[in-house]
Amino acid sequence: AVNGTSQFTCFYNSRANISCVWSQDGALQDTSCQVHAWPDRRRWNQTCELLPVSQASWACNLILGAPDSQKLTTVDIVTLRVLCREGVRWRVMAIQDFKPFENLRLMAPISLQVVHVETHRCNISWEISQASHYFERHLEFEARTLSPGHTWEEAPLLTLKQKQEWICLETLTPDTQYEFQVRVKPLQGEFTTWSPWSQPLAFRTKPAALGKDT
């Protein structure tokens, strides 16, 4: 939602967290600001303090409950407001009617591990974190492998169009150090976006056996 010169963007992690970023042209000096969440059909409301992330943008996480608790559903609408202190009062700086399951961004996949590694291939698995049971199998993944001498941006994206929490990387070079990352996205939601990339998993392929081509 945009109000005046500000941009207010929030995402729901599908369980118990709404993360928000508010950016404002002509940054407010020494002003306390917060995000206030007011669901239309729940007894609770929640507030978080916006903290600066750059010259003109602030971020905060609305913690709605225990990490794996299902605090919102597809029918919920949450009024989200940015409030900034002016004198003794709060001023509404931005406001949006937030539909959580239209604005999803899951947590980065966790527990990456090498299941099996050979000279030319490596099987890697991972787990999704704090993802709603509502999705069932309606998730997709993107993965990328960092090769020596390249950057993450240059790494080709591998797309897994189903809920598959493993991958078999092939055509790798023997005795070579690689890094691997994966991210997840639900199929649901008009404004849904990819999760952050997972922490990179470093692995090394096995050296080729002497005098043998494996």
Epitope: G4, S6, L83, G87, V88, R89, W90, R91, V92
Partner: antibody
């Protein structure tokens, strides 16, 4: 019905202090801000500052800083405005007014009846 | 501080006729959230101020629809479509966009 009832008229000597009260009823006192506005005889309105009774937090117009003190007593839903080092130009009607804690629409909706303060030697 | 200048100082009007009051701010009073916190108050003789209009053009509850507000940036107007006897008094504009909040000097509406 929202009501703000202020204390009676005061006559003070220059250099003295005056304390005006504003008793609120008809709403939850600690949910709204109380602003203070003054009107010198035949003059316009001047915003002095405000207090949030919920936590006692105050904000004063620079013009009055050091001379004005705003307090509240939540047990009797009353706000106070004390002005010190009075001079003749402080002769005015002093108003309290209610305001929303979240300023989304307007600053002040309901006003007290006003308290006349006369500063004269 | 934002200086609010009203004109005219005095406005003699005929009952049933329209009236218009101007208010000009010394600087733009659009708040950084995009809203313009320009309000109009009416003060009848011997009474406290009463909120008429907020955010330039919104009538406060109970305010007759003969009162309307308009304007943007630094220039604002309060109009009374057909003046009635009970409209006599002083009208003040007020800006709540930039602390310290400030009032105009007032316009006295009287019947000819």
């Amino acid at each position: 019905e929202v009501q703000l009832v202020q204390s009676g008229a005061e006559v003070k000597k220059p250099g003295a202090s005056v304390k005006v009260s504003c008793k609120a009823s008809g709403y939850t006192f600690t949910d709204y801000v109380i602003s203070w506005v003054r009107q010198a005889t035949g003059q316009g309105l001047e915003w002095m500052g405000e207090i949030y009774p919920g936590d006692g937090n105050t904000y004063y117009n620079e013009m009055f800083k050091g001379r004005v003190t705003m307090t509240r007593d939540t047990s009797i839903s009353t706000a106070y405005m004390e002005l010190s080092s009075l001079r003749s130009e402080d002769t005015a009607v002093y108003y309290c007014a209610r305001g929303s804690y979240t300023y989304d629409n307007y600053a002040m909706d309901f006003w007290g009846q006003g308290t006349t303060v006369t500063v004269s030697s | 501080d934002v200086v609010m200048t009203q004109s005219p100082l005095s406005l003699p009007v005929t009952l049933g006729q329209p009236a218009s009051i101007s208010c000009r701010s010394s600087q733009n009073i659009v708040h950084s959230n995009g809203n313009t916190y320009l309000e109009w108050f009416q003060q009848r003789p011997g009474q406290s101020p009463r909120l008429l209009i907020y955010k330039v053009s919104n009538r406060f509850s109970g305010v007759p629809d003969r009162f309307s507000g308009s304007g943007s940036g630094t220039d604002f107007t309060l109009k009374i479509s057909r003046v009635e006897a009970e409209d006599v008094g002083v009208y003040y504009c007020f800006q709540g966009s930039h602390i310290p909040w400030t009032f105009g000097g007032g316009t006295k509406v009287e019947i000819k």
